[in-house]
Interface confidence: low
């Protein structure tokens, strides 16, 4: 999977969408969850109704939600008051028994509010060292990383 | 009307390869997952692998993980089943069978099967 | 992966008598999504499969209703009210909920 960058400002909300093939994932429940390090696991954060049929109603773990067009086949993932250590690697998932298939690989990047008085350009990003092949950018605030990019320079 | 037509059986050499094709037609091929199950002579049935023919996802069971590949060309509604190093335990009726969708819920059952088409590993 | 286990493996019943085939799965079958994706297929000597019923009680379209399926959780039954000649085939009980897909050894059906 390529993983698709996603750029937010600091204490702003950010969406996150994740397309699908509504046919391919038709009574599949969805969840977000955040990747933890390169070959770590992927932590489940939110997921969507128990019913899935009502999965379109928005379903909150703490500042995060997530609501599901399962016609159109969208997945939409809000970030709320989006904070330095909501930067890092997710992922959108279809669950089928006690299996997920990733939807798409999310990298979230926070920027620093303009207003704020630190330098605009600041940029936040998780600890851990990471490189992907290319990203393709949604975001309007955004970019892509180039092949063999490093998006998560090593903490010294 | 849904049809399902498997070719390529035969008999095959220990150690050979086999390809079989799975030539659909009747419904949308594209948008619904297609499996392969074989039976052995007098045994029961064994799932292979699927595939989702609309971005090549596929799935395998762990015994033939590596040793079975299923791919799918869109433009021919055909699925394929690629088989290597083949032992005489391999020889069976090979089959083909769509899944069924069913609103609200993914039914997730075999609804239409190919007539199946048998494999002979012997030397 | 999700081990299926039938029982008989062979049953011997007399015509218009009813005859019953049980299921157990190794662990729950019960999908995320709430469905049951727990199958039941027929295999008549020298024919491919046929989806007889799916998602644990729903006939498949043209199957009479003599054949009902019942259970929840790991346990399931296919039931034949009222056996015809026609019946005699082998059944076997699929899940779909995991990855690999699994079936059960089958049960004969033959005429006392």
């Known amino acids: 999977h390529n993983t698709t960058v996603f750029q937010g400002v600091a204490g702003q909300s950010l969406q996150v969408s994740c397309p699908y093939d509504s046919m391919k994932h038709w009574g599949r429940r969805k969840a977000w969850c955040r990747q933890l390090g390169e070959k770590g696991p992927c932590q489940r954060v939110v997921s969507t109704h128990n019913l899935w049929l009502l999965s379109f109603l928005r379903r909150w773990n703490g500042s995060t939600a997530i609501t599901d067009d399962t016609l159109g086949g969208t997945l939409t993932i809000t970030l709320r008051n989006l904070q330095p250590h909501d930067a890092g690697l997710y992922q959108c998932q279809s669950l089928h028994g006690s299996e997920a298939d990733t939807l798409r690989k999310v990298l979230v990047e926070v920027l620093a509010d303009p207003l704020d008085h630190r330098d605009a350009g600041d940029l936040w990003f998780p600890g851990e060292s990471e490189s992907f092949e290319d990203a393709h950018v949604e975001h309007s605030i955004s970019r892509s990383l180039l092949e063999g990019e490093i998006p998560f320079p090593p903490t010294s | 009307e849904v049809q399902l037509l498997e070719s390529g059986g035969g008999l095959v050499q220990p150690g050979g390869s086999l390809r079989l094709s799975c030539a659909a037609s009747g419904y949308a091929f594209s948008s619904s997952w297609m499996n392969w199950v074989r039976q052995a002579p007098g045994k029961g049935l064994e799932w292979i692998g699927r595939i989702y023919p609309g971005d090549g996802d596929t799935n395998y069971a762990q015994k033939f993980q590596g040793r079975a590949t299923i791919s799918a060309d869109t433009s021919k509604n055909t699925a394929y089943l690629q088989m290597n190093s083949l032992r005489a335990e391999d020889t069976a009726v090979y089959y083909c069978?769509?899944?069924?969708?069913?609103?609200?819920?993914?039914?997730?059952?075999?609804?239409?099967w190919g007539q199946g088409t048998l494999v002979t590993v012997s030397s | 992966d999700v081990v299926m286990t039938q029982s008989p493996d062979s049953l011997a019943v007399s015509l218009g008598e009813r005859a019953t085939i049980n299921c157990r799965s190794s662990?729950?079958?019960?999908?995320?999504?709430?469905?049951?994706?727990l199958h039941w297929y027929q295999q008549k000597p020298g024919q491919s499969p046929k989806l007889l019923i799916y998602?644990?009680?729903n006939r498949f379209s043209g199957v009479p209703d003599r054949f009902s399926g019942s259970g929840s959780g790991t346990d399931f039954t296919l039931t034949i009210s009222s056996l015809q000649a026609e019946d005699v085939a082998v059944y076997y009980c699929?899940?779909?909920?995991?990855?690999?897909?699994?079936f059960g050894g089958g049960t004969k059906v033959e005429i006392k």
């Open positions: 998602k644990v009680s």
């Open positions: 699929s899940q779909s909920t995991r990855v690999p897909y699994t």
């Open positions: 662990q729950s079958l019960v999908h995320s999504n709430g469905y049951t994706y």
């Open positions: 069978a769509r899944l069924l969708r069913n609103q609200p819920g993914e039914s997730y059952a075999m609804d239409y």
